[in-house]
């Protein structure tokens, strides 16, 4: 695929796929698979629709658009680096060898850990944890109050440890983006 779609670890990824139903409600089966489109069907199917509804899906994979209008774009929830790769959207138009198939490349980037240039004495124990999420529109930032409190000792050493890849991985795995200041 010569175009690519991008998301950060912990975000939702969006892979567009559209077709035009012959008439409203006259739907065509569609399958989504991980890996390039094979000759028939989809390999490693993650979601499938039939003439009426979504009839198979796996966790984290769903259709966010109006699939009854032909918007069969795939949303992958809370992505990890392992979600990178080629995905196949196959529109299974009736007839022999009539399917329309599209390969879309998904690139997952590590979540950014972004310390602001704030002096250490300005840190407070009440510092919020932020999770950046993305839907179809602009990114929005939410404060997650449910994460465990980070104590003063952790805060005081955080700036020095941010370059430590193990900490960065821990932060990524938690889905949190720490903003200091």
């Amino acid at each position: 695929s010569e175009v690519e779609y991008r998301a950060e670890v912990g975000q939702n990824a969006y892979l567009p796929c559209f077709y035009t139903p012959a008439a409203p409600g006259n739907l065509v089966p569609v399958c989504w698979g991980k890996g390039a489109c094979p000759v028939f069907e989809c390999g490693n199917v993650v979601l499938r629709t039939d003439e009426r509804d979504v009839n198979y899906w796996t966790s984290r994979y769903w259709l966010n658009g109006d699939f009854r209008k032909g918007d069969v774009s795939l949303t992958i929830e809370n992505v990890t680096l392992a979600d990178s790769g080629i995905y196949c959207c196959r529109i299974q138009i009736p007839g022999i060898m009539n399917d329309e198939k599209f390969n879309l490349k998904l690139v997952i980037k590590p979540a950014k850990v972004t310390p602001a240039p704030t002096r250490q004495r300005d840190f407070t124990a009440a510092f919020p944890r932020m999770l950046t999420t993305r839907g179809h529109g602009p990114a929005e930032t939410q404060t997650l109050g449910s994460l465990p409190d980070i104590n003063l000792t952790q805060i005081s050493t955080l700036a020095n440890e941010l370059r430590d890849s193990r900490l960065a991985n821990d932060l990524r795995d938690s889905g949190a983006t720490i903003r200091i200041g």
Epitope: T20, I93, N98, F102, N103, H136
Partner: antibody, heavy 117, light 107 residues
Amino acid sequence: QVQLKQSGAELVRPGTSIKLSCKASGYTFTDFYINWVKQRPGQGLEWIARIYPGGANTYYNDNFKGKATLTAEKSSITAYMQLSSLTSEDSAVYFCARGANWAFASWGQGTLVTVSA
Amino acid sequence: DIVMTQSHKFMSTSVGDRVSITCKASQGVSTAVAWYQQEPGQSPKLLIYSASYRYTGVPDRFTGSGSGTDFTFTISSVQAEDLAVYYCQQYYNTPYTFGGGTKLEIK
């Protein structure tokens, strides 16, 4: 690299038909839509129709049903658009463009069609 | 049919300026919007797909944003070679439709 090479300019009489060609190279012809787009002199772009050469599925803009007919020949990796019952309103540049589910990434150079008595 | 409206037919700008072109869809089209540049006598060229993704080889001064019905195309620092007509297009549903075009003129 991906290329779409269109047939040359045509001067035709009103009431006649014409068949424009668009030869593809540099990619798998059967895996992408070929779209046709009309542009009258000094005007904007108007989508005519598309064909998916892998299965020969076609969709037409209602404004061009009965005017345009799309075909594709896998052996020669060429898409065609026939325009029938030509009038002065059909005088325009016609582009073919390769597309998928994410817009028209590659365009032919265009074919100028002039309909004149 | 989905109507794509570009509010300005012409925009005049100077080299180095930031310019934004807007496009409004008559109904929601998710992010299925592309932006094209057409230089005089040339074929259109894809700049932005899926509302905000820059196509391969397109300079990073070109950006796109929006979803639903309102879309914006921005050139952060206009260059002389950017003199062209810019079109938005929706490919959410057939018939695919283009905006009327915005001609960028350099002062």
